[in-house]
């Protein structure tokens, strides 16, 4: 199989983005993204732009950021059309007829490309110290650039399954992307994770007609919970359910339900779990002046989200057309999709070498998350 | 001149496995993406999967996953591709072909090698 | 996956004559994406056209190639003995790689 990514990363408009350090002329970077089921990325204006400098700035890859990388991109300009100079992109256009911004909100160029109107030329993207976006290239296309991006796109999501007692829990994309948290996966994604006695469990995100589910998960976590208490979808003890300010943040396992004290989990005479309390990740995303409470919150399907219309692939799209999903490791609440590629991301790597992203929001708890990068 | 020199003619068994090869020559071998491609007597063409020699990146298939394993040996340009738990369903012609300038159509192919089982 | 179909399975024509052949997808794919491939029987298939109308290294003039979206033909303005073959449409726009049933073109 594929070697996995070295990083991948969503956007809330549902569209996934993977970087790849691998040595490889143009054509062979673009096949790898098509035989991985996307395409090599645009890097247009506005979220898209940020998905992928949050990427790259996630950290070095092989040589740790020693020198400039080139990434390889869907840019160039095509036989027969001229250089440009007084255009953003240079008389280069994006191998995609998708909607995109502003062609003036995009990077800058590190060198001026030649003055041609007849030889087809290609783009990177330059990172100074492989991972501080300097801007577009020109490269002759038969050139070894040092990685490329995809881009990969879904229609519809699976929020992240709620642990309860699981421990241990590996995603596995279907771009080949192993981590250690993925807040919402494409159909195809596999979860798997160990419950108590090390009884291990895998779920499986499907696409069917309504939308997108975790197949073979019976209840809404992955292991049931020994007690009460669920507190950011793990189980948790009356204890740890109160937060900062003394309220109660926890919410109530299967077959129970909210006592009158509002602080405690009574048997439930319905066996509906109920949510109590203020903070509390909850499956129904907090109403907001831009997110009212949704009728139906899941499954997630990209065109529902934010009021966003659906991304429709062009006919003629020499770039396959590729589902967007919102940034791995942010909480599941519909605030933390508005705030998903806003929110400025900082990266660390751990001694392991995955990457550890933080997010700086108000909206939801930041709790970093790790990105596991090593093969199957 | 480009050239992709396939193994000859093999005869197996039910539930053996077998091993082919494709040498490659006329071109970095580690620069292109090698394919390989499966035809069944009268019938058409089936893609099983691909290696890029330059890392051991590969792709298969899903119908293929399990049965066909692609291999790549840098230092002889040689791409192999092996053939396990063989039915009558694997008898078939087997081409490796790369593509090599032409938008990722499989300009280059080899001659074949032609698998039949049979106990 | 996308799935090509192509029509008809089997045709004939008269020296001489025009001939077109037909591509379906079952879903939209880039015409950059979409190549046809000649076959003769104990032969290797060779690209004929690429990039849906792209005549290979080789290949007569009297071959063309159009189309767009789900829809896809090569063209013959006049057939000759030697392109008694089969065709088959490829496409690699989506992963994994398809072929259609390929048109088996026979002189009548």
């Known amino acids: 199989e594929h070697p996995t990514a070295d990083r991948a990363g969503c956007s809330a408009s549902g569209a996934c983005y993977s970087l790849h350090h691998a040595t490889m002329k143009r054509q062979a970077a673009e096949e790898a993204c098509i035989l991985r089921g996307g395409a090599l990325s645009t890097v247009r204006a506005g979220a898209e732009l940020r998905a992928v400098l949050a990427l790259l700035r996630a950290g070095p890859g092989p040589g740790g950021g020693s020198k400039d990388l080139l990434f390889w991109v869907a840019l160039e300009r095509r036989r027969s059309h001229c250089t440009l100079e007084n255009e953003p992109l240079r008389g280069f256009s994006w191998l995609s007829s998708d909607p995109g911004g502003l062609e003036s909100d995009t990077l800058q160029w590190v060198e001026e490309p030649q003055r041609s109107c007849t030889a087809r030329r290609c783009a990177v993207l330059q990172a100074t110290g492989g991972v501080e976006p300097a801007g577009w290239k020109e490269m002759r296309c038969h050139l070894r650039a040092n990685g490329y991006l995809c881009k990969y796109q879904f229609e519809v999501l699976c929020p992240a399954p709620r642990p309860g007692a699981a421990s241990n829990l590996s995603y596995r994309a279907p771009f080949q992307l192993h981590s250690a948290a993925l807040d919402f996966s494409p159909p195809g994604t596999e979860v798997s994770a160990l419950c108590r006695g090390q009884l291990p469990i895998s779920v499986t995100c499907i696409a069917d007609e309504i939308g997108a589910r975790w197949d073979k998960l019976s209840g809404d976590v992955l292991c049931p919970c020994p007690g009460r208490y669920l507190r950011a979808g793990k189980c948790a003890e009356l204890p740890n359910c109160l937060d900062d300010l003394g309220g109660f943040a926890c919410e109530c396992a299967t077959g129970f339900e909210l006592g009158k004290d509002g602080r405690s989990c009574v048997t439930s005479g319905e066996g509906q779990p109920t949510l109590g309390g203020t903070g509390v990740p909850t499956r129904r995303p907090p109403a907001t002046a831009t997110s009212p409470v949704p009728q139906r919150t899941w499954p997630i399907r990209v065109d529902e989200k934010l009021g966003e219309t659906p991304l429709v692939p062009e006919q003629d799209n020499s770039v396959t057309s590729i589902p967007e999903i919102p940034r791995w490791g942010s909480q599941s609440t519909m605030s933390t999709l508005q705030m998903s590629l806003q929110a400025e991301s900082k990266a660390t790597i751990t001694p392991s070498g995955s990457v550890i992203s933080k997010f700086n929001s108000t909206t939801s708890s930041a709790t970093p998350q790790a990105f596991d990068s090593s093969s199957a | 001149e480009v050239q992709l020199q396939q193994s000859g003619t093999v005869l197996a068994r039910p539930g053996a496995s077998v091993k082919m090869s494709c040498k490659a020559s006329?071109?970095?071998?580690?620069?292109?993406?090698m394919h390989w491609v499966k035809q069944r007597p009268g019938q058409g063409l089936e893609w099983i999967g691909a290696?890029?020699?330059?890392?051991?990146?590969?792709s298969y298939n899903q119908k293929f996953k399990g049965k066909a394993k692609l291999t790549a040996v840098t230092s002889t340009s040689t791409a192999y591709m092996e053939l396990s738990s063989l039915t009558n369903e694997d008898s078939a012609v087997f081409y490796c072909?790369?593509?090599?300038?032409?938008?990722?159509?499989?300009?280059?192919w080899g001659q074949g090698t032609s698998v039949t089982v049979s106990s | 996956q996308i799935v090509l179909t192509q029509s008809p399975a089997i045709m004939s024509a008269s020296l001489g004559e025009r001939v077109t052949m037909t591509c379906t997808a079952s879903?939209?794919?880039?015409?950059?994406?979409l190549h046809w491939y000649q076959q003769k029987p104990g032969s290797s298939p060779k690209l004929w056209i690429y990039?849906?109308?792209n005549l290979a290294s080789g290949v007569p003039a009297r071959f063309s190639g159009s189309g767009s979206g789900t829809s896809y033909s090569l063209t013959i303005s006049s057939m000759e003995a030697e392109d008694a073959a089969t065709y088959y449409c490829h496409q690699y726009h989506r992963s994994p790689r398809t072929f259609g049933g390929g048109t088996k073109l026979e002189i009548k």
């Open positions: 072909t790369h593509y090599y300038g032409s938008d990722y159509a499989m300009d280059y």
């Open positions: 879903s939209s794919v880039s015409s950059s994406y």
């Open positions: 006329g071109y970095t071998f580690t620069s292109y993406w």
């Open positions: 290696i890029y020699p330059g890392n051991s990146d590969t």
């Open positions: 990039s849906t109308s």
